[in-house]
């Protein structure tokens, strides 16, 4: 059978369906979870919903064969199989591999290092989120786009503040964290701060291992 991939955000309502029309006047139609767990079967004009973790949150549309699942969770990750028994005795199968992802959490920007190096300022920031498989992109006044969790840059002496935004994303959501840095490089009370929640549309966090009490948190 054909295999289709679907990625959705947890908590959403999902429609599992095939892109082609069902065989005409089919005899029976069954949806399976992980190949052998029956969810629902249609036959003789009625849908039979079986005891499973889906009972009460699925609905079958016999016309299209679509299976509606409400409030999907990560535990619903699986290959779903739609099996159709045709009037001539043949069976046809379609498979949908469903990946349910949580929205990415808000990133924490951590100052790993900042020091004077030959009158320039060396800055190392890391963008941290708990145990997720995500993509990272840093934006700001950078020589090139950086696509990992750590940003290392050397700043020439400057008067104005520099801001760096870390964007974490998976295929269903993305969140930003922005860190602004003002000279001098290692002054005890240097102004390093995060753009506020209102500016970014979400609470951001900053953690610095050194001089933690000097940093302004929002």
């Amino acid at each position: 059978g054909r295999l289709v991939h679907m990625t959705v955000v947890s908590g959403s309502n999902v429609t599992l369906n095939i892109s082609e029309s069902l065989p005409e006047n089919y005899k029976q139609l069954t949806w399976f979870y992980t190949f052998d767990q029956k969810i629902v079967e249609w036959d003789s004009g009625k849908s039979k919903y079986f005891e499973s973790k889906f009972k009460g949150r699925v609905r079958l549309d016999p016309q299209s064969g679509a299976l509606y699942i409400s409030k999907v969770q990560k535990e619903d990750n699986s290959t779903y199989v739609m099996r159709v028994l045709k009037k001539d005795g043949y069976e046809q199968e379609w498979k949908i591999k469903l990946q349910v992802l949580d929205p990415v959490p808000k990133p924490v920007i951590k100052i790993e290092k900042r020091e004077d190096v030959d009158d320039n300022c060396y800055l190392k920031l890391s963008c941290v989120i708990p145990g997720e498989s995500v993509n990272y992109t840093w934006y700001g006044e950078l020589p090139k786009e950086i696509q990992n969790s750590v940003l290392e840059t050397t700043l020439k002496p400057h008067k104005h503040s520099r801001c760096y935004t870390c964007q974490v994303s998976n295929s269903v959501s993305s969140k930003n964290g922005t860190f602004c840095f003002s000279p001098p490089c290692t002054a005890a009370r240097s102004e390093q701060k995060l753009i506020s929640e209102e500016d970014l549309g979400g609470e951001q966090k900053l953690i610095s291992e050194e001089d933690l009490h000097h940093h302004h948190h929002h």
Partner: antibody, heavy 121, light 107 residues
Framework: QVQLVQSGAEVKKPGAAVKVSCKAS????????ISWVRQAPGQGLEWMGW????????NNAQKFQGRVTMTTDTSSSTAYMELRSLGSDDTAVYYC??????????????WGQGTLVTVSS | DIQMTQSPSSVSASVGDRVTITCRAS??????LAWSQQKPGKAPKALIY???SLQSGVPSRFSGSGSGTDFTLTISSLQPEDFATYYC?????????FGQGTKLEIK
């Protein structure tokens, strides 16, 4: 894994009745139908009837009409086949077999190990 | 009732041989046909359904073909464990009926 475990061998007198059980495990019992098939010594297979474990709907071969009763107990995931008015030609191994669908498709994917019923005076 | 007739009723073959068993229905059953294998003292085992679909776990040396009234079970290269009796069965209509069986013996 899917298993159908049947009750043990029985010896019955002519005119008596026998009730064979088939306990299912490893799958959602109500999501499949059960057929009963028998095999007389040295003979071929003979379909007796079918029951839906979902709603108890049945269909029996005309030959056994009025003499066979098929039931299920969903709480114990067990199917039963009772055959009454036994004669010597009912001596056979009786098998339960799982249908691929909750309504009968006639396609069996798993079989019980069989129950030998001997009818002898 | 639909009658199912298998041929031959028995066949002798050697390991590695290609074997074909045929089954004929007394009326058109489209593709509503299954094949099963039975060894002495054991329950039947499902091999093929819908004329040509292999049951899960069945080796690919087994194949089925046909539709309407004429059907074939083929074992491409016989293995020692394949010596058994094979039954065809129609699933087109109640009552389901079986062929009389084909006994596959070692030559």
């Amino acid at each position: 894994q899917v298993q159908l475990v049947q009750s043990g061998a029985e010896v019955k007198k002519p005119g008596a009745a026998v009730k064979v059980s088939c306990k299912a495990s490893g799958y959602t019992f109500t999501a499949y139908g059960i057929s009963w098939v028998r095999q007389a010594p040295g003979q071929g297979l003979e379909w007796m009837g079918w029951i839906s474990a979902y709603d108890g709907d049945t269909n029996n071969a005309q030959k056994f009409q009025g003499r066979v009763t098929m039931t299920t107990d969903t709480s114990s995931s067990t199917a039963y086949m009772e055959l009454r008015s036994l004669g010597s030609d009912d001596t056979a191994v009786y098998y339960c077999a799982r249908d691929r669908y909750s309504s009968s498709s006639g396609y069996f994917d798993y079989w019980g190990q069989g129950t030998l019923v001997t009818v002898s005076s | 009732d639909i009658q199912m007739t298998q041929s031959p009723s028995s066949v002798s073959a050697s390991v590695g041989d290609r074997v074909t068993i045929t089954c004929r229905a007394s009326q058109d059953i489209s593709s509503w046909l299954a094949w099963s294998q039975q060894k002495p003292g054991k329950a039947p085992k499902a091999l093929i359904y819908a004329a040509s679909s292999l049951q899960s776990g069945v080796p690919s040396r087994f194949s089925g073909s046909g539709s309407g009234t004429d059907f074939t079970l083929t074992i491409s290269s016989l293995q020692p464990e394949d010596f058994a009796t094979y039954y065809c069965q129609q699933a087109n209509s109640f009552p389901y009926t079986f062929g009389q069986g084909t006994k596959l013996e070692i030559k």
